[in-house]
């Protein structure tokens, strides 16, 4: 594949990454799959500035990110280390709350209305953000 040099139409560039902001809602797994089909991944927040950039674009709306603990420990979908990485949880979160009555706890992370993170039931139909790095090779064949 060829290396991407600019973002696709309707994607926003920031610090050598491209972002796509949904305007509809999906469950976390469906959002994750949507991004993968776009040769991207759910957004992985690695810095203070990236958090603020994404927060600005999504506004005060619950929005999925690429962070989950469905298999035990918290994991970023691109393999970025969670323990040493950037975090922006709301106070008292994540709490793996079982009191929602939907079965199980809360295994997927989302931006809340003030940008800070919360864990929630993965089946909730929240908006989502896809991210892809400009410097990575795309799956598209090179132009002849």
């Amino acid at each position: 594949g060829s290396e991407r040099t600019c973002c696709p139409v309707n994607w926003v560039e920031h610090e050598r990454s491209c972002y796509w902001f949904s305007r509809s809602g999906k469950a976390w797994a469906d959002a994750d799959n949507y991004c993968r089909l776009e040769d991207a991944h759910l957004v992985v927040v690695t810095s203070w500035e990236e958090q603020k950039f994404v927060q600005h674009h999504i506004g005060p709306v619950n929005t999925w990110m690429g962070l989950h603990d469905q298999n035990g420990p918290w994991k970023w979908v691109d393999g970025t280390d969670y323990e040493t990485g950037f975090k922006n949880w709301r106070p008292e979160q994540p709490d793996d709350w079982y009191g929602h009555g939907l079965g199980g706890g809360e295994d997927c992370a989302h931006f809340t209305d003030d940008g800070r993170w919360n864990d929630d039931v993965c089946q909730r139909p929240y908006r989502w953000v896809c991210e892809t790095e400009l410097d990575k090779a795309s799956q598209e064949p090179p132009l002849l």
Partner: antibody, heavy 118, light 107 residues
């Protein structure tokens, strides 16, 4: 109510070290990031450092990077600022402040004065 | 680093006046701009956060506006307790930086 009380300030000679403390009460300390901000006599505010609620992330101002270390002990509800190789220009009132929404200082301590002089 | 430039550095006003302080960032900081009030010998106090959100307990005569690089703090119907120094601060990117301050004095 939220209370932040700094201590450890005083007069110190150039090149020496000092450790400031900030005792927190009235909120769940282990859920909040914390900052140090200083103010030289008659001057404006200068941000020094921030530490995440769990200590996993720290950021510093260029002017103190490598000389100052921010740390915390959540079991003691206390924030620290270890200062080495102190200079005359480090003379200031040092405030601790609670982080609200990533870089917003919603509660401040009363400050502790550090004077670096020979 | 992001530089924050405040103006004016001082102003004289009377009780009941409407005063406006401006703050300019050296690059786009979106709406990540906060305002603090400081009285002599006291710690700063948060007045406005995220450009225009009023901190709990702050009177509604304080308001903020702007976006990108240009911001302002307005105090309408200035009261005696408002005579203080005001600082803007960006929270978009560390190192976090403050403006130089604006001293609001009694005319």
């Amino acid at each position: 109510q939220v209370q932040l009380v700094e201590s450890g300030g005083g007069v110190v000679q150039p090149g020496r070290s000092l450790r400031l403390s900030c005792a927190a009460s009235g909120f769940n300390f282990s859920s909040y990031g914390m900052h140090w901000v200083r103010q030289a006599p008659g001057k404006g505010l200068e941000w020094m450092a921030v530490i995440w609620y769990d200590g996993s992330n720290k950021y510093y101002a260029d002017s103190v990077k490598g000389r100052f270390t921010i740390s915390r002990d959540n079991s003691k509800n206390t924030l620290y600022l270890q200062m080495h190789s102190l200079r005359a220009e480090d003379t200031a009132v040092y405030y601790c402040a609670r982080d609200e929404r990533l870089g917003i200082f919603d509660y401040w301590g009363q400050g502790t004065l550090v004077t670096v002089s020979s | 680093d992001i530089q924050m430039t405040q103006s004016p550095s001082s102003l004289s006003a009377s009780v009941g006046d409407r005063v406006t302080i401006t703050c300019r960032a050296s690059q786009n900081i979106y709406s990540y701009l906060n305002w603090y009030q400081q009285k002599p010998g006291r710690a700063p106090k948060l007045v406005i956060y995220s450009t225009s959100s009023l901190q709990s307990g702050v009177p509604s005569r304080f308001s903020g506006s702007g976006s990108g690089t240009d911001f302002s703090l307005t105090i309408s119907n200035l009261q005696p307790e408002d005579f203080s120094t005001y600082y803007c601060q960006q929270s978009y990117s560390p190192p976090l930086t403050f403006g130089g301050g604006t001293k609001v004095e009694i005319r």
